[in-house]
Amino acid sequence: EPHSESNVPAGHTIPQAHWTKLQHSLDTALRRARSAPAAAIAARVAGQTRNITVDPRLFKKRRLRSPRVLFSTQPPREAADTQDLDFEVGGAAPFNRTHRSKRSSSHPIFHRGEFSVCDSVSVWVGDKTTATDIKGKEVMVLGEVNINNSVFKQYFFETKCRDPNPVDSGCRGIDSKHWNSYCTTTHTFVKALTMDGKQAAWRFIRIDTACVCVLSRKAVRRA
């Protein structure tokens, strides 16, 4: 089984502190839900509300939980408040430069005057209705779930190339004399709550996670 991706491209630190707080509120709702037998979770799919029974233990398996997937009663803030820094210093995305996060050794936050090879943008997506699963099949993503009368929306932290036509031009800072280059959005698979028939089920779905530079060596011209 694939592992859930947790690394974030340089400069795009996921607001972990905010994620932790909201995850805590989800856990509280689940604790309450477990006290009721066979808790009903209302799943709103394509504008309709269907009451489906979901075992709250569905949310209990943390092993494959990705920081790129968030269940929240409110839209996630892109930048963390200073009080959030108690949880994790510098948990701001995409560009709070005043603090360094725990991830910054491998994924430094950009500073003024620093460049990325490819321009990218990161955003919490809260209106995903369909996605491609790990088998290449289109699946229906659960927009929101109702747990113990609290509606939790499913958000995905996505990073993509800012330029929609990045193949038209090269990457920044690449020696174009010897290299062909272009920027492209890459993907990973994260575990998300989806509809499987009439049941809610966890599936690996594909989301945008980085904008990377693709290089190929230019053919050497012989005299």
């Epitope: 400069g11 892109e78 930048a79 995305a93 995409p94 560009f95 709070n96 950009f110 003024r112 620093e114 460049f115 990325s116 321009d119 943008v121 990161s122 955003v123 919490w124 997506v125 809260g126 800012r162 330029d163 929609p164 036509n165 990045p166 038209d168 031009s169 090269g170 990457c171 920044r172 800072g173």
Partner: antibody, heavy 118, light 111 residues
Framework: EVQLVESGGGLVQPGGSLRLSCAAS????????LVWVRQAPGKGLEWVGF???????YYASSAKGRFTISRDNSKNTLYLQMNSLRAEDTAVYYC????????????WGQGTLVTVSS | DIQMTQSPSTLSASVGDRVTITCQAS??????LAWYQQKPGKAPKLLIY???NLESGVPSRFSGSGSGTEFTLTISSLQPDDFATYYC?????????????FGGGTKVEIK
């Protein structure tokens, strides 16, 4: 000192052409995204167009098909070629440098006035 | 297309007042939002980038907040030098910008 200086503005008749220049100093234009922004008299800022570090260009609908953004890395200069000019193109034209990663406009030129009138 | 809507268009205030200007994006732009100050006959000057980061050299009475679609510029105590026009700008998208990357502007005038 990092600086942008526009030139080439002036009075032009409707239907005419004009080429604006934006000379950069203190940095090389080749690694940056650069934009042209205009401001009609008494109006707000209007984004005209953009050239990426990889020379991809994008234009506002009002500029599409009439305006062309280019740059000459050897001269460290950005250009705005304006054709088929109309009275509504009358404005102060600014060039600006986009900051990497945050995509704001940190460096601006002083502006050059373009007047389209018969 | 992303539309940027700024309000109010004009604001009358006195020195020492706390002033708040809002900017709304028609779709989420994360925190790719900047605020500028412009005085007559001058080029715009960057105040805030990344929705809440103060540009170097800008007085700390200026602050920015918000993310997603709702953003705010606050001047905690208005100074004589602050009477100007303020613009927000989204940096999230560069294509399909038929609706301008800038808000319509807010003129802060003396009451």
């Amino acid at each position: 000192e990092v600086q942008l200086v526009e030139s080439g503005g002036g009075l032009v008749q409707p239907g005419g052409s004009l080429r604006l220049s934006c000379a950069a100093s203190g940095f090389t234009v080749s690694g940056y995204n650069l934009v042209w922004v205009r401001q009609a008299p008494g109006k707000g800022l209007e984004w005209v167009g953009f050239i990426s570090y990889g020379d991809t260009t994008y234009y506002a609908s009002s500029a599409k098909g009439r305006f062309t953004i280019s740059r000459d890395n050897s001269k460290n200069t950005l250009y705005l070629q304006m054709n088929s000019l109309r009275a509504e193109d009358t404005a102060v034209y600014y060039c600006a440098r986009e900051t990497a990663n945050t995509y704001d406009y940190g460096i601006w030129g002083q502006g050059t006035l373009v007047t389209v009138s018969s | 297309d992303i539309q940027m809507t700024q309000s109010p268009s004009t604001l009358s205030a006195s020195v020492g007042d706390r002033v708040t200007i809002t900017c709304q994006a028609s779709q989420t732009i994360s925190n790719y939002l900047a605020w500028y100050q412009q005085k007559p006959g001058k080029a715009p000057k960057l105040l805030i980038y990344g929705a809440s980061n103060l540009e170097s050299g800008v007085p700390s009475r200026f602050s920015g907040s918000g993310s997603g679609t709702e953003f705010t510029l606050t001047i905690s105590s208005l100074q004589p030098d602050d009477f100007a026009t303020y613009y927000c700008q989204q940096g999230y998208t560069i294509s399909n910008v038929d609706n301008n990357v800038f808000g319509g502007g807010t003129k802060v005038e003396i009451k």
